[in-house]
Structures are given as C-alpha cells and as structure tokens.
Amino acid sequence: WELTILHTNDVHSRLEQTSEDSSKCVNASRCMGGVARLFTKVQQIRRAEPNVLLLDAGDQYQGTIWFTVYKGAEVAHFMNALRYDAMALGNHEFDNGVEGLIEPLLKEAKFPILSANIKAKGPLASQISGLYLPYKVLPVGDEVVGIVGYTSKETPFLSNPGTNLVFEDEITALQPEVDKLKTLNVNKIIALGHSGFEMDKLIAQKVRGVDVVVGGHSNTFLYTGNPPSKEVPAGKYPFIVTSDDGRKVPVVQAYAFGKYLGYLKIEFDERGNVISSHGNPILLNSSIPEDPSIKADINKWRIKLDNYSTQELGKTIVYLDGSSQSCRFRECNMGNLICDAMINNNLRHTDEMFWNHVSMCILNGGGIRSPIDERNNGTITWENLAAVLPFGGTFDLVQLKGSTLKKAFEHSVHRYGQSTGEFLQVGGIHVVYDLSRKPGDRVVKLDVLCTKCRVPSYDPLKMDEVYKVILPNFLANGGDGFQMIKDELLRHDSGDQDINVVSTYISKMKVIYPAVEGRIKFSHHHHHH
C-alpha cells in the first residue's frame, strides 16, 4: 500500500509568492511559493495519485503583514481552501497568546490540529478541550493512518503560551499516544511536529511504532541529487534513521516559507511496516502556475493590508536617527529603539529567579536602512518601518558563549571608519572601544545586563558563560562577516518578523523618545570618524 505525504513547515505568513530569498516578490516571473501556486501542485498530485496526505508541521503564524493584520484568520481560511489534512502546532502559533490561537485557528480550521506534548491545566483545560488533539486517525482510501503531533518544549521561552499550558518532553509524551494508536489497530503512524531536526531524528530513533517523522522548526533543507535553488542540503531526502528497535525510519522537513512542497512516497506492507521511501522537495517556482481562484481570493484579502500599512501605529517626539552616517559609526537612537523593542518582545517571566530569560540585543547597523522624521506630526506607520527594516527578516533568540560575543564586538569595529554594516547597535550591553588599538583587540570594556537578578545591573562579560541574545536572523546566519556567531552558536530559535516586533512596541508605548545614552562608548580621543 503506497502513501504520498505532501508537507510544509515554517511557512511564516508567506501566503503570496515571494522572491527566491523568501522576501517580497519583485519580479513575478522569478517568484516562488505562495498558496495559489502550492494549490496547483497539490491538486495535480491529488489527481495523479490515490492516497495523498497534505500535512503542515507548524509555524504558519508570524512573518509578514498578513499575520499582523489578519492574526491567524488568513491561516485557517487558506489552509481550509487547500484542504490540509492535519497540522501540528508550532511555537509561533502561540505568539498572540492562547486566545490568538483558539479563536482564529483552532475554532476555524476544518482539519485536525495536533500536539501530544502540550497539556492544558486550570481553567484553560475545559476551554481548549477538543480544539487540538494529541493524535488523529485519518481515513486514507481503504486504510487508516495515525498522525501524532508534537511541539517544541522551548515554546514558553519563544512565544506566549501563558501559564496554563505545560510543554512536556516530546519523546515521553509521544510514546503512550503511539501505543494507544496501536491498540486501535492503527499500524501506519506518522509523527508530525515542530521541535527541530535534531529532535525529529531522536523521535525516529526512540519512539517505538513511529514509521515516518515529518518535522519543522529548524528550516532544514534535505535533498537527494542536485538541489534546484540556493538552499544547501543538510542531508539526503528522506533522511534515514535506524531506530533502537532496528527499523529504518524516514525523517523529512521542507525548508521554510512555502518555497518547497515536501514530497515523500512511502510503501507499507500489509502489517504497516515501511518497505521503501523516496522523494524530494518540489521547488514551487514560476514553472508552476498560480491557481486562478486561490489567487483571486488572495487579491481580495490583500486590500486590507494596503490600508493597514498607512495607518498610524504610534508617535515619535524625537528624530529617529537611522542614517548610515550615525548607525554605522556610533550609537544611534534608532538602533536603541529597535533593540529595546526586541527585548520587550521577548519578555517571558518563566522563572522566579530571573527577571527575564534574556537581556541582551545586538543589531548590525547596516540593517537599519532609513531614519524617521518626527516633523510629520510624529506619525509612525508600518510603511515607515518597512523603509527602516526592508529585508523581511526575523529577530531570533540564540545562545552564545561570552567568548563568541567578544569576537563579535571585535568584528564590529575591526575596520571601523569605512561605513560598513557590521558596526553593532546594542541593548542590555555597555561596550567601550579603543580604536587606537589594533583590530581584534579594540574592545576594552564589555558589560552585560544580568538576568538572574531582581534589580538589573551591568556586570563584566564572562568568557565561559553561556548567554542568551536577541539578534537579526541575518547575524545568526553569519551575515556581515559574523561567521563566529554562525559557527559557535549553541542554540538558534527563529523569532518574530522584524517590523512586527518594532510596530508592536510602538503601538504599546504610544509615544516614543529613544535617546543616545552611552551604550556604546569610545575611549581616548576616538569619538568621531
């Protein structure tokens, strides 16, 4: 019996087609992805093959103005239109709190939404009961297939699930649910979830009875043969894990942003054992036409986005200096504003010992692309912020050793004075540079804001300590020459859309007046370029 698994993960609000790098589509003939194009390919496969499941491994939420405006209603509407068969909850599905998951998505989805390792307690237990499930048995042709869901247990640090959801260890939670499926005589079981490739492989190895793992969260690109675009494969598709009980378990993921449709064919014997598995992600490029009816629906929903982008979010009573003459040379108040917003967006009081789990932010000055003039009645719009942060990036959470941070700050000024983008803006960090010293030895003071404290204060950076830092995904991926971050990071979790973080902060504060306040200093006479 043959099953075709089509899968997406980490789509992050890319409802419209995008450029090759998943940013805004400029030249339509070169654009990729989007739900209209995805639907064309899915329908083509459904017509050609008998037993097809379309699965999503989480993080549909968050990433473009679509989510900012529609808050998840767009996800339910278009996933319903595409007839997804099941979805696992990702960490970003909790970005607008539990209510922001229940109302727009859980109540409106016409397909099951899954997670076995999220347990509700207190008053939420009865409210959310039945709205998501640990597993679902789906009828496929004359057979049944069990899908069991899982979600990153780091979600309380990455999003806003509140205090009434407990995120259990994935493997511990999955095993009894798989066992339950076995007692229901379900002998073909897919683990569908959002914990990253390392956990996907562990699930394949450790959870008895799981036949296939379909994952997300780590944006992992797997491919067999010559890859069709810029993504470099982390391994073959499917990635085969030998389980502890000796079975060959295929593990798949399909990069991110709806650029590819994962395509995996599995052959089962009559006892539900995997005989063979093969496939590859399908690049959704312009050779696949966009479905006209879905495209028309997208265009209809688009209208509200254009209106939103010109509405006032809040006001500034000071000039927001995002000029390259400032942000690439010294502390600029636009950099301070953005870093303050980044920290504010990551406030999670999950431990009584810590006022917050993260206090530090770094931001490459080259990523700040425009100032905002306060002499326009102080008005700040999404459109204004899109000029400041035009690259459609995310502000991510990483864990780094102090020694890596020290290298990053040395890199920040290693060729100071040439208006290069690597000069770092900061939050929760006080740095002093001495430019009279040789490159690689210019950081003379680096103090960081404590987290395990009731009154936050600045302490010297410790080289061997592990710190959490919020930074742009561009830096996490080694951009602007920050190779040491990419090479030495201990953990990397994708965060919220950059513009959304700043716009939410401005809306919350209503009136802003960021200052230049001595976060970055130069010792001796090296104050100016």
Partner: nanobody, 124 residues
Framework: DVQLQESGGGLVQPGGSLTLSCAAS????????IGWFRQVPGKEREGVSC????????NYADSVKGRLTISRDNAKNTVYLQINSLKPEDTAVYYC?????????????????WGQGTQVTVSS
C-alpha cells in the same frame, strides 16, 4: 469539548420507520463529519452511515442501503438518521460519532467523539 447525544430510539414493529437524532454541543457541527454506528451485544461496532462535514457526501453500509437516509441541520447542530422498513436484525444500540475532518469513514478508529448510544428494538 464535543458532546454528542442520541435520541429517538425505542421499540418498533417490523416494517416500521424511525428517525434517530444526534445533537452536538460544545462545538459547531459545520466542521464535523458524523457517522452512525450500531452494535449488537458480543459483536463489533458496525458503521452504517456517514455524512461528511460539508454535507455533500454520504455513504451507507451495504446491509442498510436503500433503507437509510442521513441528513444534517447545521443550524440546529443536529444530524438525523431515518431508518425505513425496519427488520428484527436492525435491533442494536445505535451510536453517533464525530470527527473534525472533511471526509467520512465507516472505521471506528477514525472518530474522536462518541455519544452514549440509543437502543433500537425491532419486534412484534
């Protein structure tokens, strides 16, 4: 949580008719596919009819084809099963079951929510 309550069962003469109702609470019926099952003591639960979430597709077991009609009234959050030309072998406990999915099935494992059942006895 989804709760299902069957009603309309009872004692009926052979050749008679009956309409069973399944009322859902705690969830809008719109997105649920509903199945009717029956069980005779000592035997497995048997799927007799099903209606998908859109109401556009229905199916019936061969043993009851032509004698059953399944329908839904989403406004009333209720699904109905009309049984005509009742036979003694139709005597069973009738259960309605639901699951959030586009498609129907006659397989017990597929359904996530079950009612308590209503007894139908066909006897003269």
């Amino acid at each position: 949580d989804v709760q299902l309550q069957e009603s309309g069962g009872g004692l009926v003469q052979p050749g008679g008719s009956l309409t069973l109702s399944c009322a859902a609470s705690g969830f809008t019926l719109d997105y649920l596919s509903i199945g009717w099952f029956r069980q005779v003591p000592g035997k497995e639960r048997e799927g007799v009819s099903c209606i998908n979430s859109s109401g556009g597709s229905t199916n019936y077991a061969d043993s009851v084809k032509g004698r059953l009609t399944i329908s839904r009234d989403n406004a009333k959050n209720t699904v109905y099963l009309q049984i005509n030309s009742l036979k003694p072998e139709d005597t069973a406990v009738y259960y309605c079951a639901a699951h959030k999915y586009y498609y129907c099935s006659n397989k017990v494992a597929v359904f996530d929510y079950w009612g308590q059942g209503t007894q139908v006895t066909v006897s003269s």
